[in-house]
Each structure stands twice: as C-alpha cells, then as structure tokens.
Interface confidence: low
C-alpha cells in the first residue's frame, strides 16, 4: 500500500502478486466524509497506472478490471478530483507480476582443497521477477542434513561453510536446491557425489627447480601438494612461446625429472593436481615458476667472410667479419670470439680474443699463404672453429659470374641475379653475395653484409640492412676450391632524383682545355645510385641554350676535361647528377675564361 491512505482504500483482487497474463480487479473507495466538500455527488475518482489515467468514476467508489500487466512491478494510484481544486491522492497499490520459478538446472558442488568448504552453483532459469527464496540442502551419511537459504533475487551460489573430510571417501552425499516464491516452487534434480568427486585440490605451491652440476640435462622440478594428491600434470614452455609441453605423472611425491629442456632458455613452469585417476577435477594451475636453464657449449659454426685491401708493395689489410650464432646455437652468452691467424708454410700463428665486435682487422705481408680460424666461446666452451684460407677473391677471371643485375624488389629489398661463369659452371662450390653502402672514399669502416647461396642458384634477394634511397655496392663471388672470381654492380631498393648537384671546386687550364674538379654529392642527398654527371656551360650574358657533356658515374672520379671552349670568352659552368629517377637541380655556378691562344 502507498502512503497512509487516510481518505480511502485501494484493494486488489485476487492478490497483489499475480501470474503473468492474469487479470486483477482494483477497487478504490472513499472513507465516510472524505469526498468533495458540499458536493459529494461530484466526487470524481481517477485511477492512474504510474502517471497515466486509465479510468475514472463519479461517486464514492471505482472498480477497474486490469489485464496485460507486464513482468515486474506496476504502481496504481487513486486520486480524487473536486471542482476548483487540485487532485488529491487517496491511496495506491503495487502489483507484482511474475512467474513461478523454473526447475534449477546443472546443480554442481565443489570443495576447494582438503580444508575448504562445500559450495554449490546452479542455473536459476528464467527470471521470476519476484522475491524468490532458494534453499540448498545437503544430506550425507548417518542421516546428517545441512540446509542453507539465500534470499537474493539473483541467487545461484551458496557456500555451506562445512568441510567434507576423507575419512570415508566413498560415502555418498546428495545436494538439492529448491526455489520458492508466491506463485510456486520447484526443486532441482538431486546431485549425488562422494568426497573424491567434489574435492578440487588446491594448486601446488612452493615450486622450485634444481640443475645438478649446472647441467640442463639433469633437471628436477620440486613442489608441495596436499596430502591426498595422487596425480600431477606439469606444463612448461619457453617464456617467448605460446605452446605448452605437457607431462602427466602419477605418485610423483612432489618431484619430477625433466629431460628435454633447451640450454640458456627462460622457461615458465606450472603444475596441477588431482586426487583420483578418474574421479574429481584437476586443481587450478599453480602460480608460474620462471627459471633460466644453464648454458651449454655452443654448437654450430660461425659464418665468416673477409675483405682484402692493398696497402703497399709488401703489405695488405685483412678485415674479417662474422655473424652472431643463433640463440639455439650460442646456447649461452657469447663472452668472446677467438681469432687465429696462421701462415701455412712457416707455421707462424697469432691468436686474439675479440669481445663486443663481430669483426677484426689486421695487416699482414702480401707474401705467404694465410688462413684464419674463428670460434665463439661462452662460459661452457667454444664452438667448432670456422677455417678460411685467405685468397684473392677476384683473381680468377674465368670464375667471374656474368650478367650481374640488381633490381628493386618491393620496399627495402634488392633482387640480385647473375649467370654462371664461363669456366665449367659445375666447378662453382658456392656463391657469396656481398653488399655495403657505397661511400665515395671507399671507407673500410662501412658495415659489410653478405649471404651465401648454393651453386645451382642464380639469384638472391637481399633485404638485411637495406635502406631506401641509398646506393649499395654489390659483389657476387663464385668460389671454387682455393680460387675465386667476382663481378660487381651498384643497386638501390628505391630511388629519386638527387637533391643537389655536384659542387664545382676548381677549374684549371691545361694546354688549351680546362679540367673541372668537383666535390661529391653527400651520400644522403644522392637518393640512390648515380648514373651520370652532366657538365653544362654557356657564354656569359648569352641567351643561347647551354652545351652539355654527360659523363658516366664512377665512384672515384671527381674531375673531367673539356676542350671545346673558345679562348678569351667568359663561360658560366655548372653541374647536375642523375639517378634512374631523374636529374638533380643545378650545383653551384662558376665563371671561367680560357686564356690560351685562338687556333
């Protein structure tokens, strides 16, 4: 009922709580002497459903039959309207529309851990929209029964607060849940179980790992479990992997040997427990243990390459380069690389440990036969050495690969193709494709990249350390025993017209012609591989078209003669550079007047 209802009453029949689809009769009646002052015949009673008028009647009472009420609560209010005054609230009533509870489904109970308490969950079915009381009953041996109620409209879980013990693990317990509201009641099907069925062990704890003699092959995982645990399952994986390795063990008693772990790898380990082979459920997974396995000596061999540079008539510079071992080959932190240089005929040898670099440069005599061996060392030992005889890689002209080309292949890739050498192609044991950024000074500090290709291949896609708008010097070597032949080409993955032209730094007169010298365009402004330079000239103050001379680009060339200028005429000269994408803007302009005699 709403408010104090001093002036009248609202009655609802058959009940304030009705089944969905039912009809109700609502009566509003005034108490004696509570009508309109002087005009009792003018009483106008109005029935509101929430804020909407649904019926009215002149007199002391009003009857209304209402159908089609929705699920939930509907508020009806009766008001009195008198002439020349506001409506007065008489009384009201709430009607609750709902349904009888459905039979609770999927009743299941669980006890977390041997010391835990029994808790059950179920599915309520459709919402009754009414106050519904759930009673959970558990009956066990010796006529013991536990009962617990919850009065929550969303109730689908109850914890009995009791602990089942393993004294008689085969004893049966039966659980049942009953839902009751004003419109009816319904009980679930009984759920019968034993201690072993419903006890879900606590996850294992205190997980540790031991590596005997710091060896990955002698590894034991230890943990602690509740007393009745019979089965364990272990899962483990490298920390950077998504896939688990799984192991099932019986009667492990808190320890298990793992035989297939990789060295120098961080692993994640988890363990789960179960009380019985085919009864009950697995525990949650334990908290993760993360541990790194010990190092083992490296496997595999380093990929080693080298460059030779002539210094003078008696000396040459050797630069060695090698690639890091993969993680699975290094099997630990590489502490240093050991490089041994040996003169094969005289037996002289020198060994050096290199840390922090994957290259080494030394100067050796040009005479003698030289060999190097390079190995990688971690805390447990060294890899097998890679041995290389130092030879002139481009000496055998007949071994030089033919028709070498370099073409852009998508973003930051260059496809290098070639034809086998004229000399018996079957003599080639392998090709090596080498590339480095082109620097006009021939800078030996520029990083060197290489890849090896099988003798039957005639192409290679290079993508490592390839940047757009940079020109690369690419060499293809054909290796056969202690001989090698090579061919080279320039290539880029992406190009556009150079950003600037060469800067003319000097014009000198020599025997009636002139020599123009220029500074190279900075590498970052070349925008790819340069193909040509152009030298333009025209008479100063003339409107005629300039003349030009186009010179093929060569890395080391920084000057060029022009012999078609007239003496005692002042010329303006400038230069541009071209890539396959186009011509640069002008470089600086220089004026020059040839002093020599006219022919």
């Amino acid at each position: 009922k709403i408010d104090a209802c001093k002036r009248g009453d609202v009655t609802v029949k058959p009940s304030h709580v009705i089944l969905l689809g039912s009809t109700v009769n609502i009566t509003c009646s005034l108490k004696p002497r509570q009508g309109c002052f002087h005009y009792s015949r003018r009483n106008k009673l109005i029935l509101y459903k929430f804020d909407r008028r649904i019926n009215f009647h002149h007199g002391h009472s009003l009857n209304s039959q209402v159908t089609g009420l929705p699920l939930g609560t509907t508020l009806f209010v009766c008001k009195l309207a008198c002439i020349n005054s506001d409506e007065i609230q008489i009384c009201g009533a709430e009607i609750f529309v709902g349904v009888a509870p459905e039979q609770p489904q999927n009743l299941s109970c669980i006890q977390k851990g041997e010391q835990g308490t029994v808790a059950c969950t179920w599915e309520r079915g459709r919402d009754t929209h009414l106050y519904t009381e759930y009673t959970l009953q558990l009956s066990g041996p010796k006529n013991l029964t536990w009962q617990k109620q919850c009065k929550d409209i969303y109730c689908d879980y109850l914890d009995f607060g009791i602990n089942l013990t393993p004294e008689s693990p085969e004893s049966n317990f039966t659980a049942k849940v009953t839902a009751v509201n004003s419109l009816g009641s319904s009980s679930s099907l009984p759920s019968t179980f034993t201690f072993l069925d419903i006890v879900r062990p606590l996850p294992p704890w205190d997980i540790r790992i031991k590596f005997q003699k710091a060896s990955v092959s002698r590894c034991t995982l230890y943990w602690r479990d509740e007393g009745l645990v019979l089965l364990n399952r272990l899962r483990y994986r490298p920390s950077n992997s998504r896939l688990w390795n799984m192991v099932n063990v019986t009667k492990a008693k808190g320890r298990h040997d793992l035989l297939d772990l990789k060295p120098f790898t961080e692993y994640e380990f988890q363990i789960s427990s179960k009380l019985h082979l085919y009864k009950g459920s697995w525990s949650d997974w334990s908290e993760s243990l993360r541990a790194q396995t010990p190092e083992e000596e490296p496997t595999g061999m380093l990929d080693v390459w080298y460059m030779k540079r002539h210094i003078d008539y008696s000396r040459q510079q050797i630069s060695l380069f090698w690639k890091n071992l993969s993680v699975s080959e290094a099997r630990g932190k590489i502490l240093h690389y050991q490089v041994t240089l040996q003169e094969l005929t005289g037996g002289k040898a020198m060994t050096q440990n290199i840390t922090g670099h994957t290259s080494w440069t030394t100067v050796i005599p040009r005479t003698g036969n030289w060999a190097v061996a390079v190995s990688a060392a971690n805390s447990k030992g060294s890899s097998l050495p890679t041995r290389i005889n130092i030879m002139n890689l481009c000496e055998a002209g007949l071994l030089a690969p033919r028709q070498v080309s370099a073409n852009s292949e998508g973003m930051d890739n260059i496809l290098v193709t070639w034809q086998p050498p004229r000399k018996d192609p079957s003599a080639v044991q392998e090709y090596v494709v080498e590339w480095r950024e082109l620097h006009p000074g021939g800078d030996t500090q520029v990083p060197l990249n290489w890849l090896r290709s099988r003798p039957y291949n005639v192409s290679a896609l290079i993508s490592e350390n390839i940047k757009s708008y940079i020109c690369y010097e690419i060499r293809v070597y054909a290796l056969s025993g202690d001989q090698g032949g090579c061919s080279s080409i320039l290539g880029n993955s992406k190009h556009k017209a150079p950003l600037s032209g060469p800067h003319i730094n000097a014009i000198t007169e020599e025997k009636g012609s002139i020599l123009i010298s220029w500074n190279s365009i900075p590498v970052q402004e070349q925008m790819g591989c340069l193909l040509h330079y152009r030298i333009y000239w025209k008479e100063r103050d003339s409107n005629s078209q300039p003349q030009l001379c186009e010179i093929p680009y060569r890395v080391s060339q920084n000057s060029h003669p022009i012999n078609s200028l007239q003496p005692r005429v002042t010329y303006v000269l400038w230069m541009t550079a071209l890539t396959a994408a186009g011509e640069s803007s002008h470089g600086n302009e220089r004026e020059f007047c040839l002093q020599g005699k006219a022919n």
Epitope: A119, T121, Y154, C155, D156, Y157, L158
Partner: nanobody
Framework: QVQLQESGGGLVQAGGSLRLSCAAS????????MAWFRQAPGTEREFVAG?????????FYDNSVMGRFTISRDSAKNTMWLQINNLKPEDTAVYYC?????????????????????WGQGTQVTVSS
C-alpha cells in the same frame, strides 16, 4: 606487473552522479571477469557490480544498486567504468576495482572477493545529504 588504477571519486550531493574509471595495465583483461566492490568504514568489502568476461559480457548487480548503477568496459582501452546515478548517503565508501584471470558466469562467484586475482587501491566516494 599488473596494476589497476581507479579514478573519478569525490564529494557529491545526494541525487548527483559520478563516473568511476578503472584502468588496467600490464595485462589484457578484455576476456576476463572484472568487478566493482565498495567498503564503508567499519564494514566488510561488498560486491557492487561485475562483468562475466564471457563473450557478450553479462553484467551483474547487487540488489541495493540495481537500476542506479551501470557497469561497462572498453576492451580496446583495457578500461572499466561504473556510472552511478541518484547517489544516496549510504553509497559513501571506498570503491575498489577488481580483475580475475578467468571467465565467471555464476552470479554467486562474481560477487565473491576470492574470485579476483588483482585489486586496485580504491577511490573515495562521499555523498553529502
């Protein structure tokens, strides 16, 4: 490491509204159960609203806040919200955000403190009459 950070609390008059936020970092909880709890001085921490974490995210509410509170989340931003309307003095409490590392589809389990693995530091909501 995983962190939950609540914000949006404050002093508000009865009948007013607030929007609490919970930002999760260090882990993605978009597929897992998350909830709001509150604790008034001298009382136990109580469940307010929760999300199941299953596909389609079922929302659960305590009877006392049904209709006034709305829980939601943005999985892409790893953020959960609690919109509180028509605030009452009895809503005064520290509001905590909680996250599980599993899906919870039972109302009974959603409202249990032990269901959740991670908790925020809380944000104070004070409602003056």
């Amino acid at each position: 490491q995983v962190q939950l950070q609540e914000s949006g609390g404050g002093l508000v008059q009865a009948g007013g509204s607030l929007r609490l936020s919970c930002a999760a970092s260090g882990r993605t909880f978009s597929n897992y159960a998350m909830a709001w709890f509150r604790q008034a001085p001298g009382t136990e921490r109580e469940f307010v609203a929760g999300l199941s974490g299953s596909g389609g995210d079922t929302a659960f509410y305590d009877n006392s806040v049904m209709g006034r509170f709305t829980i939601s989340r943005d999985s892409a931003k790893n953020t959960m919200w609690l919109q509180i309307n028509n605030l009452k003095p009895e809503d005064t409490a520290v509001y905590y955000c909680a996250a599980a590392t599993h899906v919870v589809v039972s109302y009974g389990l959603v409202r249990r403190r032990g269901t959740y693995d991670y908790w925020g530091q809380g944000t104070q909501v004070t409602v003056s009459s």
